[in-house]
């Protein structure tokens, strides 16, 4: 049971990419406001986004404290202008979110090719190590810092003059591939966490091609 003229939130959904994590829900409020609480399975509830008319709440600051923990959130509904009002059970109406484990569930953001350098018949392709909002010792960790060897990159590459693609993998952020001399190549990368069963892959990076600004060519 809940407060008269308030409705419980529903469709609570976690939206998370590279640990930037937002809880979304419905409905758009009419004469009501929301407050969100978040907790680990064993921890205390912490309130966020107090008395908001938004239908989303950024919980990044809470989940980055320990991305391997499992979190639960709940959204409380209050009548607008009367937030002290409670239901007959003595507490406001609320709805629980699904459980969320950031390390296992955050989506991998679209990677970016930082650079490529050709030396003779080898090309070194470097993937940008994207910064996350996860902190350790007051510094922000990169995606590689957080996932370590759990994160691999798949490189797709092809001659500019042909559509036949090849692929290679790395568990660092660098590839060293063989190419044909005198040919221009295009590159795209995808981030993958092979040990996951869902949300294993990112979208592909933008395509970068030799002969454009990003790379460097050295004939040895």
């Amino acid at each position: 049971s809940g407060t008269t003229n308030t409705v419980a939130a529903y469709n609570l959904t976690w939206k998370s990419t590279n640990f930037k994590t937002i809880l979304e829900w419905e409905p758009k409020p009419v004469n009501q406001v929301y407050t969100v609480q978040i907790s680990t399975k064993s921890g205390d509830w912490k309130s966020k986004c107090f008395y908001t008319t938004d239908t989303e709440c950024d919980l990044t600051d809470e989940i980055v404290k320990d991305v391997k923990q499992t979190y639960l959130a709940r959204v409380f509904s209050y009548p607008a202008g009367n937030v002290e009002s409670t239901g007959s059970a003595g507490e406001p109406l609320y709805e629980n979110s699904p459980e969320f484990t950031p390390y296992l569930e955050t989506n991998l953001g679209q990677p970016t090719i930082q650079s490529f350098e050709q030396v003779g018949t080898k090309v070194n392709v470097t993937v940008e190590d994207e910064r996350t909002l996860v902190r350790r010792n007051n510094t922000f960790l990169s995606l590689r810092d957080v996932f370590g060897k759990d994160l691999i990159y798949t490189l797709y590459y092809w001659k500019s003059s042909s559509s036949g693609k090849k692929t290679a993998k790395t568990n660092t952020n660098e590839f060293l591939i063989d190419v044909d001399k005198g040919e221009n190549y295009c590159f795209s990368v995808q981030a993958v966490i092979p040990s996951r069963t869902v949300n294993r892959k990112s979208t592909d990076s933008p395509v970068e091609c030799m002969g454009q600004e990003k790379g460097e060519f050295r004939e040895i």
Partner: antibody, heavy 117, light 107 residues
């Protein structure tokens, strides 16, 4: 449990085409690449290519680029390989397999394709 | 393209014996190597991934080592059910080539 179930055996004439299907179940179909491999007594295991159901991207061994076409149907969790311009030496057992941590963890039961006039 | 060469092509060993087969890559592939076994009339079955990691359900008598270009698979105590053909596979870069196989028989 995770399964890949392939279509039944085929006997086809030289020059014809054949389509082999591979139905995935028990897992999130778009999250894992589907690889295709063939096996014949003469050449052993040959890697044909793979398709990433997530984005439709295909990678082929250059020897099969003009021979095989890979596709998926998300609505039925089916992967397909069409082999065209069949020759006697294309007689083989064709396998689909699902990737995991840099390997092929689950395999279909194989589809025998016999090219015979 | 990376070629994978396995040796010996066939092995005959006694039950309880220690058996080692090797796989040599024509270029370095770090630890991106897989081992499979295949019994007659069956699909290949994953034994080892990432050069050294046992796949789920694989008995502990199997072990593997190597990185770069040189890899090996060892059965510490051969069992009758280990009769099969063993294949290595480059899973580093396409084409993801297989070795030609090692056929293992019981003496």
């Amino acid at each position: 449990q995770i399964q890949l179930v392939q279509s039944g055996p085929e006997v086809v004439k030289p020059g014809a085409s054949v389509r082999v299907s591979c139905k995935g179940s028990g897992y999130s179909f778009t999250d894992y690449n589907i690889y295709w491999v063939r096996q014949s007594p003469a050449k052993g295991l040959e890697w044909i290519g793979y398709i990433d159901p997530y984005n439709g991207l295909t990678i082929y061994d250059q020897n099969f680029r003009a021979k095989a076409t890979l596709s998926v149907d998300h609505s039925t969790s089916n992967a397909y390989m069409e082999i065209n311009s069949l020759r006697y030496e294309d007689t083989a057992v064709y396998f689909c397999a699902r990737d995991v941590t840099s390997a092929l963890e689950f395999w279909g039961q194989g589809t025998s394709v016999t090219v015979s006039s | 393209d990376i070629q994978m060469t396995q040796s010996p092509a066939s092995i005959s060993a006694s039950v309880g014996e220690r058996v080692t087969i090797t796989c040599l890559g024509s270029q370095t592939i770090d630890t991106y190597l897989a081992w499979y076994l295949q019994k007659p009339g069956r699909s290949p079955q994953l034994l080892i991934y990432a050069a050294t990691q046992l796949a789920d359900g694989v008995p502990s008598r199997f072990s593997a080592s190597g990185s770069g270009t040189d890899f090996s698979l060892t059965i510490s105590s051969l069992q009758p059910e280990d009769v099969a053909t063993y294949y290595c596979q480059n899973v580093y870069s396409s084409p993801f080539t297989f070795g030609q196989g090692n056929k293992l028989e019981i003496k």
